[in-house]
Amino acid sequence: GVFNYEAETPSVIPAARLFKAFILDGDKLLPKVAPEAVSSVENIEGNGGPGTIKKITFPEGSPFKYVKERVDEVDRVNFKYSFSVIEGGAVGDALEKVCNEIKIVAAPDGGSILKISNKFHTKGDHEINAEQIKIEKEKAVGLLKAVESYLLAHSDAYN
């Protein structure tokens, strides 16, 4: 079956700059600013555009070793990134895949709001665990905060 979910979190970083750093250069930046969460990101197929397959490897001691993600859309005009987790991580016996859309919208205060929509494709009658969703959301927010801290400390980067 399918379970739809969404969450949002604010950022002090303007939308264009956050999209550039967090999304467009996330493969390089995340292992650098959050090595405790992401060891490496490699393109195993494609050049970053739709259809690209990425492998994200997690550090020793993490609950999962890796995930494979398929890039479905990169919208540089509307600051929207759509990707599907197709292997590894929570994908397995109960979960077929997770489709994720990250949209960064401008906030009135000059910062931005990160909107994350998830579509969980479960196998059979498996239910999505609310705790699992909470953990995934917290991980995403943690990565965002790490990128935010880096950008605040490096005001010349990603402008």
């Epitope: 079956g1 399918v2 379970f3 739809n4 979910y5 479905d72 759509s82 494709h121």
Partner: antibody, heavy 122, light 108 residues
Framework: QVQLVESGGGVVQPGRSLRLSCAAS????????IHWVRQAPGKGLEWVAV????????YYGDSVKGRFTISRDNSKTMVYLHMNSLRTEDTAVYYC???????????????WGQGTLVTVSS | EIVLTQSPGTLPLSPGERATLSCRAS???????LAWYQQKPDQAPRLLIY???SRATGIPDRFSGSESGTDFTLTISRLEPEDFAVYYC?????????FGQGTKVEIK
């Protein structure tokens, strides 16, 4: 403007098959999931099936699972509902409906076709 | 599956009056993932509200949606002659996507 036009309905005997078509125009078809929703005479709405923007993901209501198959042709901007082993309780107006949100879809329906009537009777 | 129960089944009102339609969910509707549709005889349904309270494109502001826990409400502030129809709620948080049985707003 967005248009969805269903065709293929008619009278069919129980156990037989029918294929419904939905021709779409007025929007970027390949970016949207498409659903089929039906309405038995004098009754409420029942969701039947959905197909994702790329055709990879297909889901069905319990009452049609294993008998109906949804498919799409993005080059022709068409969606199809192949209905096998039809039962009298499948008698309904069948609507195709566009998902209200692009790419992965949110599973609400912002545009509907006018519907096509399927009557299953011996 | 999530069961939606609409009440009342029929709502007899006069033009100019306020209509309050209810939709109760059997379980929590995360993210306010509930839509309202209007259907007139021999016509396809039309989307009025999504996300429990967001009006769809071209929908007059006399239509509004609200929620409180698992209870959702569609309000038509001042009924126009063209508003007499059947109204359905629909959840889109968890498949299968389900509809309420409908509320008919009829002329008193």
């Amino acid at each position: 403007q967005v248009q969805l036009v269903e065709s293929g309905g008619g009278v069919v005997q129980p156990g037989r098959s029918l294929r419904l078509s939905c021709a779409a125009s007025g929007f970027t078809f390949s970016r949207y999931a498409i659903h089929w929703v039906r309405q038995a005479p004098g009754k409420g709405l029942e969701w039947v099936a959905v197909i994702s923007y790329d055709g990879d993901d297909k889901y069905y209501g319990d009452s049609v699972k294993g008998r109906f198959t949804i498919s799409r042709d993005n080059s022709k901007t068409m969606v199809y509902l192949h209905m096998n082993s039809l039962r009298t309780e499948d008698t309904a107006v069948y609507y195709c409906a566009k998902d209200g949100y692009s790419l992965y879809g949110k599973d609400y329906f912002d545009y509907w076709g006018q519907g096509t009537l399927v009557t299953v009777s011996s | 599956e999530i069961v939606l129960t609409q009440s009342p089944g029929t709502l007899p009102l006069s033009p100019g009056e306020r209509a309050t339609l209810s939709c109760r969910a059997s379980q929590s509707i995360t993210n306010s993932y509930l839509a309202w549709y209007q259907q007139k005889p021999d016509q396809a349904p039309r989307l009025l509200i999504y996300g429990a309270s967001s009006r769809a494109t071209g929908i007059p502001d006399r239509f509004s949606g609200s929620e409180s826990g698992t209870d959702f409400t569609l309000t038509i502030s001042r009924l126009e002659p063209e508003d007499f129809a059947v109204y359905y709620c629909q959840q889109y948080v968890r498949s299968p996507w389900t509809f309420g049985q409908g509320t008919k707003v009829e002329i008193k």
